[in-house]
């Protein structure tokens, strides 16, 4: 089955620039399909842009200006990309790759799409780091004894653009757990967002990782929080200078234990 | 040129009773297109639910039935119980592959229904609430309640700032709440709400503990010192990242 | 209720050309994909092709190099043009509008190809 | 493109049900239709879109498509039903007909 990687969740540019969105595609040879690419501006229809066939050869929608799409393929790494010259306000949308799939009869064929990459487009001068702060809540002893049940939250603040996505997980689990959360909201010239997982007992006891997609994480890798298991001692860390890690950073804590 | 319209641009569905959605064809005859669904939730992830000839995508045969009425040149969709996952934007699509008219292997799209999934009616039931902290943030969770309207606050001299409360439909039907804020004096905070002419404090739910029990946090130190990235420890603990607790027992 | 009317010589010569004519009535004519079928007597139905109210055709490979068809939306019309005709084309001659199927159809000429 | 393949011939009782057959290769892929003709008239579409019945077609009239082959079913047949049937589908550029199938009411 083919499946669509669109691994830039934002594309933030000023007027003018150029920006180049990728497309990674799995589970099917990308030399062996079409390649399509829509957008989608605000309050609009989804609209096909352009596509680009097994043999290479590119169709654009009629109506779309010449000169501002440009689609490729590069078949050693199974990307497609979509560079569009000259960004201006009206290109602010998001863009989806899509392929046509065939389900296991012949003939079934299903068109499936990326996550789509949002195009923003600031005339801001914004601070060095607009990458999302985190700050970890762990659950209150009275949830956790009444309840039997304990509530993680993960609050991330101070950063830009807004498009963010959040999942959780079990440490050594690939398995996204079912979540909740905030919408983003603006706090000046950033935005903040939380999202909190409501875990049984029995699931206290292991480590629980918060795992953000933003466009500014260092090194363009998600960033995952930490949030020790849940044990005799609860413990609290601080919320100016939290440590998450990036890639396969582990997160290490001091604590000073001081009994009455 | 053809369009594709939705019937209505918002849909309130009720957990577990059934919903249709309908998309007519203007300027064309539907018959002559393949019709498609997608639905886009939050994060803009589009997932493909249904293409006709009985396609549907991984898990939404068992919940969802499209079909295509030629004669009024609607497509339709019908969602036969759902569930807080079904809330997004569902999206009709049209494409001719497989047809004997005017092929063409673009989808042609609609303009998106959304659809806000609310909890069945129920009885009324009072939340429990519970409070988080740290360092100056604090968050109130407020735990399964019914119906919706409630009232959220944090009781505090010294307030920084306040947050909008996010309400979300919990796992089992009933409703969820969280509001954030940030105090001078975040020890001190409690949460209390306002829910069906009734107040509940998270003072009622507080535990007394004895040393057998769960640390209760009491308060965060930091040792501020200039920020640097975040290390690969192996042995070797970076001091300006320790984290400085104090954990009273 | 749609109908359909097919009109046209009913003798042809070998060699020649068929030439028809459906005149749709009570009914839209845009939007609709319209076919021609026939059916040699005693014998089953074969699709001859189909035209789109823009123009736009589609005939069967098999007999694709002598048929044209074409379109009048002005009158409601559409024609069928079968040439070079043999005896093996003698039959009854259908118009019919297709959705997903043809829902509705003319009543049949029967076209012979005689010298 | 591709044949459909149906039976020449089926005979029911009245009262019966009689099911008639059309194959070809992935029928089940496309719709299927099903039309009805008694002499001297034009077909009548019975079945479209595998299994629906236009508005004035008795509720006997049943039809169904999977895998290679679409079956067109007539429950509680009646004499009225004697006629020649045939299936038909398309697929992405051509119009497919069956050789028809005669049914006959005992």
């Known amino acids: 089955a083919g499946h669509l990687e669109q691994p830039q969740i934002s594309s933030t540019k000023t007027l003018s620039k150029t920006a180049r969105l990728e497309c990674v595609v799995s589970g099917i040879t990308i030399s062996a399909t079409s390649v399509y690419w829509y957008r989608e501006r605000p309050g609009e229809v989804i609209q096909f842009l352009v596509s680009i066939s097994y043999d290479g050869t590119v169709r654009k929608e009629s109506g779309i200006p010449s000169g501002k799409f440009e689609v490729d393929r590069i078949p050693e790494t199974s990307t497609s990309t979509l560079t569009i010259h000259n960004v201006e306000k009206q290109d602010i949308a998001t863009y989806y790759c899509a392929l046509w799939e065939a389900q296991q009869e012949l003939g079934k064929k299903i068109k499936v799409f990326g996550p789509g990459t949002k195009l923003i487009i600031t005339d801001k001068q914004l601070d060095a780091d607009v990458s999302p702060k985190p700050t970890i809540f762990l659950p209150s002893i009275a949830e956790t004894k009444l309840q039997k049940a304990g509530t993680y939250l993960c609050l991330l603040e101070k950063f830009f653009p807004d498009v963010i996505k959040i999942h959780w997980q079990e440490k050594k689990s690939n398995t996204i757990l079912g979540s909740q959360e905030g919408n983003t909201m603006k706090t000046n010239d950033t935005y903040m967002k939380f999202s909190w997982l409501t875990v049984p007992e029995k699931s206290l006891d292991k480590e629980h990782r918060c795992i953000v997609r933003h466009e500014n994480n260092k090194n363009g890798v998600d960033q995952e929080i930490i949030f020790p298991p849940i044990k005799t001692d609860v413990i609290t860390m601080d919320p100016k200078d939290n440590c998450s890690k990036d890639a396969n950073d582990t997160l290490l804590l001091q604590l000073t234990n001081t009994s009455a | 040129a053809i369009e594709l319209v939705p019937e209505h641009q918002t849909v309130p569905v009720s957990i577990g009773v059934p919903a249709t959605l309908r998309c007519s064809m203007k300027g064309e005859a539907i018959g002559n297109y393949y019709i498609n669904w997608y639905r886009k939730t939050q994060g803009n992830t589009m997932t493909f639910i249904y293409r006709e000839k009985d396609i549907y995508g991984p898990g939404f045969k068992d919940n969802f039935q499209g079909d295509i009425d030629i004669a009024k040149n609607l497509a339709v969709l019908k969602i036969l119980a759902p569930s807080e996952r079904d809330e997004g934007s569902y999206y009709c699509a049209c494409d001719t592959l497989g047809m004997g008219g005017e092929y063409t292997d673009k989808l042609i799209f609609g303009k998106g229904t959304r659809v806000t999934v609310e909890p069945r009616s129920q009885p009324h039931t009072k939340p429990s609430v519970f409070v988080m902290k740290n360092g100056t943030n604090v968050a109130c969770l407020v735990k399964e309640f019914y119906p919706k309207d409630i009232r959220i606050n944090l009781v505090s001299s010294k307030k920084i700032t306040e947050f909008d409360p996010a309400i979300v439909i919990s796992p089992s039907g009933k409703y969820n709440a969280v509001k954030l804020g940030k105090y001078e004096d975040s020890n001190s905070v409690t949460c209390s709400v306002q829910h069906d002419n009734k107040t509940v404090h998270s003072t009622d739910f507080e535990v007394k503990t004895d040393s057998t029990d769960h640390v209760k946090p009491k308060e965060t130190e930091n040792t501020k010192q200039p920020s640097k990235s975040c290390h690969k420890p192996k042995a070797i603990v970076h001091t300006e990242k320790v984290n400085m607790m104090s954990l009273t027992v | 209720q749609v109908q359909l009317q097919e009109s046209g010589p009913g003798l042809v010569k070998p060699s020649e050309t068929l030439s028809l004519t459906c005149t749709v009535s009570?009914?839209?004519?845009?939007?609709?994909?319209w076919s021609w079928i026939r059916q040699p007597a005693g014998k089953g139905l074969e699709w001859i092709g189909r035209?789109?109210?823009?123009?736009?055709?589609i005939y069967n490979p098999s007999l694709k190099s002598r048929v044209t068809m074409s379109v009048d939306t002005s009158k409601n019309q559409f024609s069928l043009k079968l040439s070079s005709v043999t005896a093996a084309d003698t039959a009854v001659y259908y118009c019919?509008?297709?959705?997903?199927?043809?829902?509705?159809w003319g009543q049949g000429t029967l076209v012979t190809v005689s010298s | 493109s591709s044949e459909l393949t149906q039976p020449p011939s089926v005979s029911v009782s009245p009262g019966q049900t009689a099911s008639i057959t059309c194959s070809g290769d992935?029928?089940?892929?496309?719709?299927a239709c099903w039309y009805q003709q008694k002499p001297g008239q034009s077909p009548v579409l019975v079945i479209y879109?595998?299994?629906k019945r236009p508005s004035g077609i008795p509720e006997r009239f049943s039809g169904s498509n999977s895998g290679n082959t679409a079956t067109l079913t007539i429950s509680g047949t009646q004499a009225m039903d004697e006629a020649d049937y045939y299936c038909?589908?398309?697929?992405?550029?051509?119009?497919?007909f069956g050789g028809g199938t005669k049914l006959t009411v005992l």
């Open positions: 019919a509008r297709w959705l997903r199927a043809f829902d509705y």
């Open positions: 009570y009914g839209s004519f845009s939007s609709f994909y």
């Open positions: 035209i789109y109210t823009s123009g736009g055709t």
């Open positions: 992935k029928l089940g892929d496309k719709y």
């Open positions: 879109q595998d299994s």
């Open positions: 038909q589908a398309w697929d992405s550029s051509t119009v497919v």
